[in-house]
Interface confidence: medium
Amino acid sequence: EETSDHDNSLSVSIPEPSPMRVLLGSSLTIPCYFIDPMHPVTTAPSTAPLAPRIKWSRITKEKEVVLLVATEGQVRINSAYQDKVSLPNYPAIPSDATLEIQNLRSNDSGIYRCEVMHGIEDSEATLEVVVKGIVFHYRAISTRYTLDFDRAQRACLQNSAIIATPEQLQAAYEDGFHQCDAGWLADQTVRYPIHTPREGCYGDKDEFPGVRTYGIRDTNETYDVYCFAEEMEGEVLYATSPEKFTFQEAANECRRLGARLATTGQLYLAWQGGMDMCSAGWLADRSVRYPISKARPNCGGNLLGVRTVYLHANQTGYPDPSSRYDAICYTGEDFVDIPENFFGVGGEEDITIQTVTWPDVELPLPRNITEGEARGNVILTVKPIFDLSPTAPEPEEPFTFVPEPEKPFTFATDVGVTAFPEAENRTGEATRPWGVPEESTPGPAFTAFTSEDHVVQVTAVPGAAEVPGQPRLPGGVVFHYRPGSARYSLTFEEAQQACLRTGAVIASPEQLQAAYEAGYEQCDAGWLQDQTVRYPIVSPRTPCVGDKDSSPGVRTYGVRPPSETYDVYCYVDKLEGEVFFITRLEQFTFQEALAFCESHNATLASTGQLYAAWRQGLDKCYAGWLSDGSLRYPIVTPRPSCGGDKPGVRTVYLYPNQTGLPDPLSRHHVFCFR
């Protein structure tokens, strides 16, 4: 939005669409330019010309705050924003009033106004900035500190969130978040935010407030986790009835409303948006929680936050699934697909989150539990996140899921088919100021499949011989992943999600290095766990030299801003189940493939699962549907007619530049997993 009084007067513009939506913890540049048609203004022959005066303010419902004022090359910054805001281009470019804001907090949301005054002329432009996302602490239900790094990432993903970055935790801390619980972050460090230090919560900062850190930890160590929920398309709805719902009834009620049980991350976003309910409800992970936005003594102990109902006084255990609460549903188009029976009792993925009370009705909370320590048993709270003063019920019967017996099944033999497996890695354009790897190998090796494999069902046998040419990682495999749409399209957060959705986790630099040492090569820059971007090159060639010139090695671009886009390197460990190949005469559309696997107590295999099965010896010269809509096939023993001369998981792309997913209505074989 821009304003000026008349055509040839001073004019100010912010050439950005409003609102600008930015992630918590990130940095922001708001461009602001002004055109000043006036000659230097003088008030009298003896006085120096008046320079334009630049003023940046932030306007919220409550108040207007001047962030900085600049004139004659001098910038005066409001002391509260001293290390936060700057004018990066002023005074080098006198008409460029672009504002830079570091480490955005939720509190930085508002209308930003760029105002320029020159003599009696005055013009301004505004931009609404919405800082999106919320950091929350997440804990396995069984007990405190039970999540290794991989499970921590999955715990967040299953709750419509991703593992938080240090910048996001810092921003949340500056917004008031306080938690005396050590939790994993995206860079593999373990930290916790403390505003009022006390014994047991001093960490590496003694009695100073701040985010404590244990540094980078071994991925097998176990802690809680800090998750980050960014934004959601749909809405959270409280469903209630006079008699309330058991867990199963709650799930059914949400379905009846065209919705499903909400995740913890979705409830946090709703709470952040203002949701306030003094009645606890079931969530998708079988936890019971309620959001408090308006503090009152008889509802959550006069504290704000998403409160959790625990079974035991030491804040562990789910309420019995037959106990009755409201249903907290989520309606919208961005459902997170969680299998109905995913959160089984005692399973590795049993997860829930912090703090709280037992508020079946609005109850006073008479007794406090001793405040916890960084490795002890609780949490202190400063807005916006939470404390505990739990009153707990008697323990109830534990709950277990009974798996259904599997159905045996058989299928027809393979039939020959023609498709287009991946050529040796040919990638398209994508310009970067530094030499982004671009492999151009001769034309697309579109190879027709032959019908040489007539095995109906192939199961990846655990302990199969090591795959030749495969990185020797203890039981696991590193693979390059790219969504079907385009090369270099994943932000750091999307990269983590992409790996998790495919049944893997984002690889660490050490895992990529080990893969490289075992002969892995890929001329595609991809995110790693530590927010660096790298790619392994065994045989250097022009577009793939990176920072190592003609020497082999893992190239790196160093730590990159999380908003930049690349591919990703994922790591999948051992296969917990089996991948099997299915075909029939007419083959399957993507939708039919989904339904077929489900009808046989299986799911469509993920890319990660197929890689793990390949690692264990699965070899198939037919491309099959996978859960992300991609079409791939695993080759252990290379043969000229089948995927070239190297072992690996081949991908069928729509376009010769190796982008695009196949049409979901096209017909192919299927890889199922169970």
Epitope: I111, E128, V130, G274, T331
Partner: nanobody, 123 residues
């Protein structure tokens, strides 16, 4: 606070079309879920359609599915209701409503309401 002003109502023949607009004041329009409701003479107010803050998710009453389309333009702070194949039973005062995104307690739990615009479907 958000102020809502509806426009575009009028008299239309059965089978005809109308497009209602709802202009919102306030700078945070993009963080609101927007809805259309209607109230026929002597009847209770009923839900017609809603659209999420980004425009990515829409909801419709069964009685208007396939005939009405809700959309929004966040840069213009405006939400629209395109009404096709209008029937006499669509005659009502149409209200625009807004609520903060991300959560609601019932279909009717909107915080801000417009004054309404009259739509008459008659031959």
């Amino acid at each position: 606070d958000v102020q809502l002003v509806e426009s575009g109502g009028g008299l239309v023949q059965p089978g005809g079309s109308l497009r209602l607009s709802c202009a919102a004041s306030g700078r945070t329009f993009s963080t609101y879920t927007m809805g259309w409701f209607r109230q026929a003479p002597g009847k209770e107010r009923e839900f017609v359609a809603a659209i999420s803050w980004s425009g990515g998710t829409t909801y419709y009453a069964d009685s208007v599915k396939g005939r009405f389309t809700i959309s929004r333009d966040n840069s213009k702070n405006t939400v629209y209701l395109q009404m096709n194949s209008l029937r006499p039973e669509d005659t009502a005062v149409y209200y625009c409503a807004a609520r903060p995104r991300y959560y609601y307690y019932s279909l009717y739990s909107y915080d801000y309401w417009g004054q309404g615009t009259l739509v008459t479907v008659s031959s």
